[in-house]
Interface confidence: low
């Protein structure tokens, strides 16, 4: 099977993760969206939107908030008060069935570490934002996957922008391609 290239981001405990996932609104405006984490080889759905989606009607599951803007093809994910145990691989997906999802982006490997006292960025109000935009599908022997384009690392205490080009990826079996824990 083909493995997705994951991108690694480091956060301190207490920080908030903000992720924006664009999707093709013509295809997926009325679809449910989900935020998933890999546990072993199996994706675990942590939160999913209702159907039909309503603009700016947030779905909250614990520390995770999903806000779908179907008129604009935008899913916003927020994970607050990050903990060490949140480390892993995450993805935005179009949720169609527990065993069939359209994965929108390369997985992001989240690494949450304990912040030493006085370390900038260790407070709950410190947030790093990740922009995720649909990826161009690349031909592979296994399931279609994306290759990363640009990762811009801003200075400490700043923010991170991740962007990948093109249009959404269609993956029929998420378990074939995602190996490690995920985060967005």
């Amino acid at each position: 099977t083909t493995e997705l290239t994951e991108e690694k981001y480091e956060y301190k405990e207490g920080q908030t993760l903000e992720v924006k996932c664009d999707y093709a609104l013509e295809k997926y405006a009325n679809s449910r969206k989900a935020w998933q984490k890999m546990e072993g080889k199996m994706p675990k759905i942590l939160a999913k939107t209702e159907r039909p989606s309503e603009n700016s009607h947030p779905v909250q599951v614990g520390r995770i908030t999903l806000e779908d803007y179907p008129d604009h093809g935008l899913l916003q994910v927020r994970m607050t008060n990050l903990q060490v145990e949140d480390s892993g691989l995450y993805q935005c997906v179009i949720y169609q069935h527990p065993k069939e999802s359209h994965v929108l982006f390369n997985p992001i490997c989240l690494v949450v570490t304990k912040g030493s006292s006085g370390t900038p960025g260790s407070s709950e109000n410190s947030t790093q934002n990740v922009y995720r935009t649909p990826s161009t599908t690349a031909k592979a022997l296994g399931p279609r996957y994306t290759s990363p384009r640009t990762v811009t690392q801003a200075p400490p205490e700043s923010t991170v922008v991740v962007s990948t080009p093109g249009s959404e990826i269609n993956l029929t079996n998420v378990t074939d391609i995602i190996r490690v824990p995920v985060f967005n």
Partner: antibody, heavy 116, light 105 residues
Framework: QVQLVQSGAEVKKPGASVKMSCKAS????????INWVRQAPGQGLEWIGE????????FYAQKFQGRATLTADTSTSTAYMEVSSLRSEDTAVYYC?????????WGQGTLVTVSS | DIQLTQSPSSLSASVGDRVTITCSAS?????MHWYQQKPGKAPKLLLY???NLASGVPSRFSGSGSGTDYTLTISSLQPEDFATYYC????????FGQGTKLEIK
Amino acid sequence: QVQLVQSGAEVKKPGASVKMSCKASGYTFTDYVINWVRQAPGQGLEWIGEIYPGSGSTFYAQKFQGRATLTADTSTSTAYMEVSSLRSEDTAVYYCTRRMAAMDYWGQGTLVTVSS
Amino acid sequence: DIQLTQSPSSLSASVGDRVTITCSASSSVSYMHWYQQKPGKAPKLLLYTTSNLASGVPSRFSGSGSGTDYTLTISSLQPEDFATYYCHQWSGYPTFGQGTKLEIK
């Protein structure tokens, strides 16, 4: 209807700071991102940064990191931007905008003039 | 940052003309948004996510494109369309094109 109403024009000396406001109405303030964009006289549009009023989290253009500060008061549905260490090239109209995938509503703008 | 280059920078046209403005990105972006600005006014959203008309925008405006090349088309110019047009991308740090000024011939 959705409205973003910005504070009035400001004249500042080089090195000073300016704080402007953007009062939102007609929608749930915490559901949308507020962006700030500026436009120097006769020039194009330049993105400064954004704030999520619900969480207070911010994201800045690298050029403005450390010099612009975005805040939001959810009790009054008002977003604020403070720009410090003003220089003459900061003379511009500053707009607040509401963002989803694009900036669908804009304030009328606040003209900031920096002159000695 | 992704640079956006609009072409042409200025354009003279007549009422009823079909006008095309292009926006070229320095690297691939997912979508392009377009704004219209008239002198002394705030910009107004015309098209979002490449081809979707914003609320209240006439159907003579249309957008297309993908990757690095995007187009805004006005099928039949009306007097109120003379303005400056900006493209805008959000596939990373947000950037705008330098603007295209559409003037009456």
